[in-house]
Interface confidence: medium
């Protein structure tokens, strides 16, 4: 995502809202240009703190970050629902918090990937995230921009629920993807992507172990454990929702 070239004098303007901002995008709209840890209060939610990344594309909420293996991502449903990790380092914001930010709106999901050779890839999707009653299903609402679309995520319109080892909602009848891989994810058939997999600093020899890693199949391949990932979300204006 493009960095802010020109930091603006930060948001004393927030006071003109007379309430906490709903999300990072609203923060951006009232003049905040500094990325960091901010308190927000989505509609109908208690306040909580989020990492905002301010870019020339507006304000984005960071919902996931991996870069050093310092946090265990192989956690149960309740942990993925509530969130875990370190705001300074590796973390998962929490499905309930993400859903409170997006509400019923369509959103832009940005996925930043980095391999061990310093190569980086940015993917952007238009998505809709359901609530817990849908197992936080992720639905693609528009075609994917860029080269890496089709086989990485469900086809446009298909909804994939979130799965953990103790709550198996994946699209495989014969397998629990979260259990045979690692971490919680929107698992379709286990093989497209998993950014919450096990962190490997060196590539293990056994494929059985390797498949548990962090991967994005159409970028560096099914058995290439990525070095770093960041996921960010930005709700679209209400009228953009279908």
């Amino acid at each position: 995502l493009p960095e802010m070239a020109q930091p603006v004098d930060p948001a004393h303007n927030v006071s003109r809202l007379h309430r906490l901002p709903r999300d990072c995008q609203e923060l951006f709209q009232v003049g905040e240009r500094q990325s960091g840890l901010f308190e927000i209060q989505p509609q109908g939610s208690p306040p909580f703190l989020v990492n905002c990344k301010m870019t020339s594309d507006g304000g984005w909420t960071v919902i996931q970050r991996r870069h050093d293996g310092s946090v265990d991502f192989n956690r149960p449903w309740e942990a993925y629902k509530a969130g875990f990790g370190d705001p300074h380092g590796e973390f998962w914001l929490g499905l309930e918090k993400v859903h409170s930010i997006t509400g019923d709106r369509n959103s832009r999901l940005a996925v930043q990937l980095r391999d061990w050779d310093g190569n980086a890839e940015l993917l952007q999707f238009s998505v809709h995230l359901g609530g817990e009653d849908t197992a936080y299903s992720l639905q693609l609402t528009a075609p994917v921009a860029g080269q890496l679309g089709a086989t990485t995520v469900p086809p446009s319109g298909l909804s994939v629920p979130f799965s953990t080892w103790d709550q198996d909602h994946d699209l495989r009848r014969d397998k629990n993807c979260a259990k045979s891989l690692s971490g919680g994810w929107w698992f379709g058939t286990c093989s497209h992507s998993n950014l919450n997999g096990q962190y490997f600093r060196s590539i293990p020899q056994q494929r059985q172990k390797l498949k548990k890693g962090i991967f994005w199949k159409t970028w560096r391949g099914r058995y290439y454990p990525l070095q770093a990932t960041t996921m960010l979300i930005q709700p679209m204006a209400a009228e953009a929702a279908s």
């Epitope: 948001a11 927030v14 905040e32 500094q34 990325s35 960091g36 840890l37 306040p47 703190l49």
Partner: nanobody
């Protein structure tokens, strides 16, 4: 002008507990958030935890999550840091800081007022 005074530091054995206090005087009702940072010898000052004054949102560094608890007593204009299961790694000077306005809560530059610090020593 706001003054912050920390207390409660000291020497404790690994596995023990301490409770730090940070009393704000002056115009503390104008605060947006109060946080704790720490600095070990030869290291940079690092974020530990923060609490927002009105919303009451809290955030912890992963290294202290589940062991440290931040709380506030608005009537006394005081923020507390309850530190349990202390480890040698927790040994540092602990600083209380106050942010006057809405902003980035783990950037030290966004905190307007700082206490003088209180030493926490953990012996193994």
């Amino acid at each position: 002008e706001v003054q912050l005074v920390e207390s409660g530091g000291g020497l404790v054995q690994a596995g023990g507990s301490l409770r730090l206090s940070c009393a704000a005087s002056g115009r503390p009702f104008s605060m947006y958030a109060m946080g704790w940072f720490r600095q070990a010898p030869g290291k940079e000052r690092e974020f530990v935890t923060v609490i927002t004054w009105s919303g009451g949102s809290t955030y912890y560094a992963d290294s202290v999550k589940g062991r440290f608890t931040i709380s506030k007593d608005i009537a006394k204009n005081t923020v507390y840091l309850q530190m349990n299961s202390l480890k040698p790694d927790d040994m540092a000077v602990y600083y209380c800081a106050a942010a006057r306005r809405y902003g980035n809560l783990y950037n030290t530059n966004n905190y307007d007022y700082w206490g003088q610090g209180t030493q926490v020593t953990v012996s193994s």
